[in-house]
């Protein structure tokens, strides 16, 4: 790397969030090089003394990998040549949260960028009519959340109404003792209305909608990660 000390290359990362127990991606791109053997990728984590991952001379070099990442990391080897240094992190743990550095060396020079990685649990809510209840009741359930979220109900007809007096939310710890199941019940619902159950923590926001008419029930849900800056 004759000139690598004198030039800097552009490295770009994207803040992201990982869902505990699932696989996550730490995104990083750089100015590509024509020769794979000239590219070195190092992923480091603040406060962790071993490497998260290293890729050099066209293959993984994991002798100095920290044990907390053992067997859980991979780069997209076939995409390195086009400037993709993103890291796949398997089985995301709560302790994976923190500041990561994507450090790149190529024949053009070197560069790095930091990335904030949040970890938690988030899942899509499902809203159903609770036919077992004595009055018209909706039940909103989401299987995995962490940290503990807030739950807010809203309705299309009564916009701005506060449903806290007519709803009840409970959090039940899941078997792995970290994530929790969220159950929220809304009482005294009226027909021909669309209700939304909004679950939010500092990592994600999810909404489950249900439209109840005399002839049909329509459901829709979506989830959005917060603070992910492109």
């Amino acid at each position: 790397f004759g000139i690598s000390g004198r030039h800097s290359i552009t490295v770009t990362t994207v803040a992201s969030a990982g869902n505990i127990g699932e696989d996550g991606i730490l995104s990083c791109t750089f100015e590509p090089d024509i020769k794979l053997s000239d590219i070195v990728i190092q992923w480091l984590k603040e406060g962790v003394l071993g490497l998260v991952h290293e890729f050099k001379e066209g293959k993984d070099e994991l002798s100095e990998q920290d044990e907390m990442f053992r067997g859980r990391t991979a780069v997209f080897a076939d995409q390195v040549i086009v400037g993709n240094a993103s890291l796949r992190l398997k089985n995301v743990q709560l302790t994976d949260a923190g500041t990561y550095k994507c450090y790149i060396i190529t024949s053009k020079g070197k560069g790095n960028a930091n990335l904030e990685y949040k970890t938690g649990a988030f899942s899509m809510p499902e809203v159903n009519v609770d036919y077992n209840a004595s009055s018209e009741t909706l039940r909103c359930e989401a299987p995995r959340w962490f940290p503990q979220p807030t739950v807010v109900w809203a309705s299309q007809v009564d916009q701005g109404a506060n449903f806290s007096e007519v709803s009840n939310t409970s959090f039940e710890l899941n078997s792995e003792n970290v994530t929790m199941k969220v159950v929220s019940v809304l009482y005294n619902v009226t027909i021909n209305n669309t209700y939304s159950c909004m679950i939010e923590n500092d990592i994600a926001k999810a909404t489950g909608d249900i439209k109840v008419t005399e002839s049909e029930i329509k459901r829709r849900s979506h989830l959005q990660l917060l603070n992910s800056k492109a």
Epitope: Q65, D66, R70
Partner: antibody
């Protein structure tokens, strides 16, 4: 050059505590973990645990949990290993060693004798 | 914990002999194995790390293996090589050691 210098030999009574120090020089103290390994007379090597000098976070061998405490002083580049409720089977040479996935170098060792 | 079973526990050999020491891990540890040499009254010294990479030692020492089976070979034993050798896994904590192999003069 990288050096780890340990405190001198100790003789302790059963039930007492011992605190062994390990002073690092010749490298950035916070760049690598510090491990502790012990060796009973005529026996093999036993991994005791490690400390992250940056954060102070520790990992201990299960059999020593509750009796061992590893600390560090970044201002003097020194790590400490304290073992409490000593018993005769704790008689050993105690080593500190620097590393991530392999240990190099090692301290010269500290002989701790537990005897009534 | 991962067990490291080292064999033989001792061996007698002459200067110039080829010596092989083996280590077996109780589970797959990739190439996270290190070998140390210890002489009486001294601290252990790193010989080989990451299964096959020589530290600052003569080329007569070599290491091989991956997964569960690992070997330390001394191609031509020298007088200064009479010592006890330990393997160690660094795949996951606790970083356990093998029981040691004492290489004695025949």
């Amino acid at each position: 050059q990288v050096q780890l210098v340990q405190s001198g030999a100790e003789v302790k009574k059963p039930g007492a505590s011992v605190k062994v120090s390990c002073k690092a020089s010749g490298y950035t103290f916070t760049a690598q973990y510090m491990y502790w390994v012990r060796q009973a007379p005529g026996q093999g090597l036993e991994w005791m645990g490690r400390i992250n000098p940056t954060s102070g976070n520790t990992v201990y061998a299960q059999k020593l949990q509750g009796r061992v405490t590893m600390t560090r002083d970044t201002s003097t580049s020194t790590v400490y290993m304290e073992l409490s409720s000593l018993r005769s089977e704790d008689t050993a040479v105690y080593y500190c060693a620097r590393g991530i996935n392999w240990f190099d170098p090692w301290g010269q060792g500290t002989l701790v004798t537990v005897s009534s | 914990d991962i067990q490291m079973t080292q064999s033989p526990s001792s061996l007698s050999a002459s200067v110039g002999d080829r010596v092989t020491i083996t280590c077996r891990a109780s589970q797959n540890i990739d190439t996270y194995v290190n070998w140390y040499q210890q002489k009486p009254g001294k601290a252990p010294k790193l010989l080989i790390y990451a299964a096959s990479r020589l530290h600052t030692v003569p080329s007569r020492f070599s290491g091989s293996g991956s997964g569960t089976d690992f070997t330390l070979t001394i191609s031509s034993l020298q007088p200064e090589d009479f010592a006890t050798y330990y393997c160690q896994q660094s795949y996951t904590s606790p970083f356990t050691f093998g029981g040691g192999t004492k290489v004695e003069i025949k």
